[in-house]
């Protein structure tokens, strides 16, 4: 008779995210290793060629602990050299598979993600995960000391790379600035520079001068007025953080002067995965767990044309104004349509621009700045 | 010693052209984004035009625009006015400024002056 | 664009008198507003940037305040040296504006 064939056994959610998790901690850990070795070895062929002549008998100090009357075989040294220069090659070729790798993974844990969305496998409390209270601190704190930036400019002889590169060589004037991350044309950006160092203003919205209810595109690309109200576009900052986790510092302000500030630390997917926003680990110093949402669940970027909300019945970014990393609709949204007074309806209420957990559902915000600092690249996820 | 050197200065008749330089020394003039600032005789100062350091970004006060051409070689450590459709109201010395910020564009103090041509 | 008027277009003074000359600008500017010194036959030279901040070099006598619209330069105690004319500048929008400028001679 015919072959019976068994129904298949779906993984359960569970299992799909431990695997996921463990794949993605390989990825990482195999990352890690390589990006070490790989220093390690960078370390070694710069205090060989620093030794240089000396090795070989000329004159000229070293910094290779030697006898000072000791001298290295030329012989040697050149295959010393030539091994270190195999050894290189293959750890980066070991790197760039990781990586190859990791973007791999990362890809699948956002499919993985969005299929258990549309088969409704997803506890609701984990669809509002951005409800998960992050730190609080009335300000970014204040512009550190001016340090003279013509000491250390001579370092570079590029474009920065972002903000805090800026802050690195020595500027402590915030303002509009000129950038280029690696594979990226040069743009224009607005530094806010911190003792923490130099923070990249992503949003700006103050006095509803700029429409932000527009297409993808548009949030791709970048719109306003960098001297006023402006989204600096999810492809610049993609190319400013890469793969790097980084922190995000959201700037609230009520029509009372109120002001609050909260921080996260965040990871940003690039296109392919819709500019998925995910929250990583607690910024340090900060409140811990509370930041952290269920899983490390990933958001991706909505916008009325490009619908990746993690809600099947609604169009979020088309029932409520404006593109942004919708969970399921209530929780937040910087780039609603902006009000200068609370209108009657409801339903045009809930257009504005809000943060749920601040001043309510229902308060249109007076002033909104988002901010964004890479954190070093060991942090990344 | 770190200075800038304006050149290129002279008589033309109206609707005739000039072309300024800029000679930069003892900074990373790549690091910059330049300026050129007029003054007519007698008068005060008025900015014409701006360049960042890539070249990227370049504006021009609306009495020039059209007619000036802002460009610069890093390489060089040169800065340039291309000045075209000359006007009477266009004399006046020409200084070369620095913006005070290293890769700044726009919103910056000019810390760093040449003697003008 | 934005205009800016100073305040008085000439003062003379004597040496270790104070003088206050005043900036105002057509619209809000927030602190983006720099003091220039120029000499006769000089090129001018960058004494206060934003406001309030000296810049490097600059004699501690001269000072600035002030934001938004009205801005204000300070000498402490003048010295001969400090015969010159002074000008601010607004960065806040394009095109950079400069003021008029106010001349200060020692009697």
């Known amino acids: 008779g015919p072959v019976q064939s068994k129904s298949p056994r779906f993984a359960s959610w569970d299992e799909m995210n431990v695997l996921a998790h463990g794949l993605l901690q390989l990825g990482q850990g195999l990352r890690e290793h390589a990006e070490r070795t790989r220093s390690q070895l960078s370390a070694l062929e710069r205090r060989l060629s620093a030794c240089g002549s000396a090795c070989q008998g000329t004159e000229g100090s070293t910094d290779l602990p030697l006898a000072p009357e000791s001298r290295v075989d030329p012989e040697v040294l050149h295959s010393l050299q030539t091994q270190l220069k195999a050894q290189n090659s293959r750890i980066q070729q070991l790197f760039h598979k990781v990586a190859q790798q990791q973007r791999h993974l990362e890809k699948q844990h956002l499919r993985i993600q969005h299929l258990q969305s549309q088969f409704g496998l997803l506890d609701h409390k984990h669809l509002d995960h951005e409800v998960a209270k992050p730190a609080r601190r009335k300000r970014l704190p204040e512009m550190a000391q001016p340090v003279d930036p013509a000491h250390n400019v001579s370092r570079l002889h590029r474009l920065p790379r972002d903000c805090q590169e800026l802050f690195q060589v020595g500027e402590r004037q915030s303002g509009l600035f000129e950038i280029q991350p690696q594979g990226s044309p040069p743009f224009l950006v607005n530094c806010k520079m911190t003792s923490d160092g130099g923070w990249t203003v992503i949003q700006r919205r103050h006095d509803g001068s700029v429409d932000f209810n527009r297409p993808w595109e548009a949030y791709k690309a970048g719109f306003g007025d960098p001297h006023g109200e402006f989204w600096l576009g999810l492809e610049k900052v993609h190319s400013i953080t890469g793969d790097r986790n980084s922190r995000l510092a959201v700037q609230l302000r009520d029509w009372d002067g109120n002001a609050e500030l909260l921080q996260f630390s965040v990871h940003l997917g690039g296109e392919d995965t819709a500019y998925s926003l995910q929250l990583t680990a607690p910024v340090a110093g900060q409140l811990g767990a509370t930041t952290v949402p269920p899983s490390g669940l990933s958001v991706p970027f909505s916008t009325w044309d490009q619908d990746h909300d993690l809600r099947r019945d609604k169009n979020c970014a088309k029932s409520l104004s404006g593109g942004w990393w919708f969970g399921t609709c209530s929780h937040s949204n910087l780039n609603g349509q902006y009000f200068r007074s609370i209108p009657q309806q409801r339903q045009k209420l809930k257009k504005g621009i809000f943060w749920k957990t601040w001043r309510g559902r229902y308060y249109p915000l007076q002033a909104t700045t988002m901010l964004i600092q890479p954190m070093a690249a060991e942090a990344a996820s | 010693e770190v200075q800038l050197v304006e050149s290129g200065g002279g008589l033309v008749k109206p609707g005739g052209s000039l072309r300024l330089s800029c000679a930069a020394s003892g900074f990373t003039f790549s690091s910059y984004s330049m300026n050129w600032v007029r003054q007519a005789p007698g008068k005060g100062l008025e900015w014409v035009s701006s360049i960042s350091s890539s070249s990227t970004y370049i504006y021009y006060a609306d009495s020039v625009k059209g007619r000036f051409t802002i460009s610069r070689d890093n390489a060089k450590n040169s800065l340039y006015l291309q000045m075209n459709s000359l006007r009477a109201e266009d004399t006046a010395v020409y200084y070369c400024a620095r913006d005070g910020a290293i890769f700044g564009v726009v919103n910056w103090y000019f810390d760093l002056w040449g003697r003008g041509t | 664009e934005i205009v800016l008027t100073q305040s008085p277009d000439f003062q003379s003074v004597t040496p270790k008198e104070k003088v206050t000359i005043t900036c105002r600008a057509s619209q809000s500017i927030g602190s983006s507003l720099h003091w220039y010194q120029q000499k006769p036959d000089q090129s001018p030279k960058l004494l206060i940037k934003y406001a309030s901040q000296s810049f490097s070099g600059v004699p501690s006598r001269f000072s600035g305040s002030g934001s938004g619209t009205d801005f204000t330069l300070t000498i402490n105690s003048l010295e001969a040296e400090d015969a010159a004319t002074y000008y601010c500048?607004?960065?806040?929008?394009?095109?950079?504006?400069f003021g008029p400028g106010t001349k200060v001679d020692i009697k």
């Open positions: 500048h607004q960065s806040s929008n394009l095109p950079h504006t």
